[in-house]
Interface confidence: low
């Protein structure tokens, strides 16, 4: 199906590890699959912007911890 | 302001801790905020269903670990 | 701030217009801004996957219409 | 199955049609489903707040149009 085509691949082509955890309101972890060979971490910032986080940087653990602290 | 009318609430009414990590394709961590006093963990299953996970550790850590393993 | 750096730019580098509206559960429209010169349309599929839609294709209007029909 | 416990509900309790399009940075259209009988329109404002928009008001079309204008 066309949804599976090479066009779709990964949503995250560029990633960053430069983000302040307190600016993040939610984080989505998307499993690797036929559409994308690597897992993806997409953060939503307070202003509604979305960014992809670097999986190699240990930052995401800190972010998840911070998000879960109520 | 009238914008105040458009209130959100928690998405998660009930939570479960019995979910098989391998059934999950993505996981969203939503920070607590004015709309909801507790952080929320929403998993999307392979069949497209969304469920709320119990924040009690460490199941979600296991799930995140599994999702990130490519 | 580093979050504003060129690395972040647009989340959607690749887009598709080949997607079945019925496979989509939600659609996010992100306004253009300093981080990204064009608006972005991100669709979430039933299986939790996310894809970027082509803004030039009139398909997204059909998708929005379909999503709003309850 | 115990997974059934993790129910979601509608995010939007109240909606508003009183919102200035220029205050909105992103808009999410969520399809109705088992978790919620009606489609939902959630706007993220510049200040990071999220509000639910009234689906009956034609305003959202104007907002989407404005968001997509780069």
């Amino acid at each position: 199906e066309a949804e599976e085509d090479g066009d779709l691949q990964c949503l995250c082509v560029k990633t960053t590890s430069q983000v302040r955890p307190r600016h993040i309101t939610s984080l989505e972890v998307i499993k690797a699959g036929p559409h994308c060979p690597t897992a993806q971490l997409i953060a939503t910032l307070k202003n509604g912007r979305k960014i992809c986080l670097d999986l190699q940087a240990p930052l995401y653990k800190k972010i998840i911890k911070k998000l879960l602290e109520s | 302001e009238a914008e105040e009318d458009g209130d959100l609430q928690c998405l998660c009414v009930k939570t479960t801790s019995q979910v098989r990590p391998r059934h999950i394709t993505s996981l969203e961590v939503i920070k607590a905020g004015p709309h909801c006093p507790t952080a929320q963990l929403i998993a999307t299953l392979k069949n497209g269903r969304k469920i709320c996970l119990d924040l009690q550790a460490p199941l979600y850590k296991k799930i995140i670990k599994k999702l990130l393993e490519s | 701030e580093a979050e504003e750096d060129g690395d972040l730019q647009c989340l959607c580098v690749k887009t598709t217009s080949q997607v079945r509206p019925r496979h989509i559960t939600s659609l996010e429209v992100i306004k253009a801004g300093p981080h990204c010169p064009t608006a972005q349309l991100i669709a979430t599929l039933k299986n939790g996957r996310k894809i970027c839609l082509d803004l030039q294709a009139p398909l997204y209007k059909k998708i929005i219409k379909k999503l709003l029909e309850s | 199955e115990a997974e059934e416990d993790g129910d979601l509900q509608c995010l939007c309790v109240k909606t508003t049609s009183q919102v200035r399009p220029r205050h909105i940075t992103s808009l999410e259209v969520i399809k109705a489903g088992p978790h919620c009988p009606t489609a939902q329109l959630i706007a993220t404002l510049k200040n990071g707040r999220k509000i639910c928009l009234d689906l009956q008001a034609p305003l959202y079309k104007k907002i989407i149009k404005k968001l997509l204008e780069s």
């Epitope: - | 801790s17 098989r20 119990d54 924040l55 009690q56 | - | 115990a2």
Partner: antibody, heavy 115, light 112 residues
Framework: SLEESGGRLVTPGGPLTLTCTVS????????VSWVRQAPGEGLEWIGT?????NTYYASWAKGRFTISKTSTTVDLRITSPTTEDTATYFC?????????????WGPGTLVTVSS | QVLTQTPSSVSAAVGGTVTINCQAS????????LAWYQQKPGQPPKLLIY???DLASGVPSRFKGSGSGTQFILTISGVQCDDAASYYC?????????????FGGGTEVVVE
Amino acid sequence: SLEESGGRLVTPGGPLTLTCTVSGFSLSSYGVSWVRQAPGEGLEWIGTITVSRNTYYASWAKGRFTISKTSTTVDLRITSPTTEDTATYFCARSLSSYYYAFNIWGPGTLVTVSS
Amino acid sequence: QVLTQTPSSVSAAVGGTVTINCQASQSLYDEKNLAWYQQKPGQPPKLLIYDASDLASGVPSRFKGSGSGTQFILTISGVQCDDAASYYCQGEFDCSSGDCSVFGGGTEVVVE
């Protein structure tokens, strides 16, 4: 910590409620289970109440026991005690979100059912 | 769902090794959701191992858990007098097909 109370000598048939009082953690973050141990016997899982008040019971315990909670206590109601319900009753907190691996236990409270 | 523990009783010399088996009648939830406890007379149980092989906080490394699916083992090496107690395995099963949680029948360890 956890502490059970309410254990006593009862006659068969009269309902009995045991209370588990928690301190040092929140019931909005952890589930609590009830486990019992008859004299000289092994451990038996009775049931669990989760963060979101979902309850799960052992098949043998359904209808015989009811678990409920407030913000700081978890109650176990024995609907109609029989002599087989004579045991020490423990409440326990899960290490995680599972229905097993209980890392914090109360000291137990003894229930004796006798006519 | 049943967890069968063997043997029901075992004797060991100080410094020796004890092996306790726990067999599940069907595969555990997520394959490894099994815990081991130690219980001494008049006391509540103490968690030793969870997730089949993870050591609980403060538990000496001479306690070792292994196994997956339906077969699990608790090994106590370099047995000490303080290890004399009853040991129980506890498994988590799929709640939708019966009991969420089940304990094994127990194994009494006597240290000579």
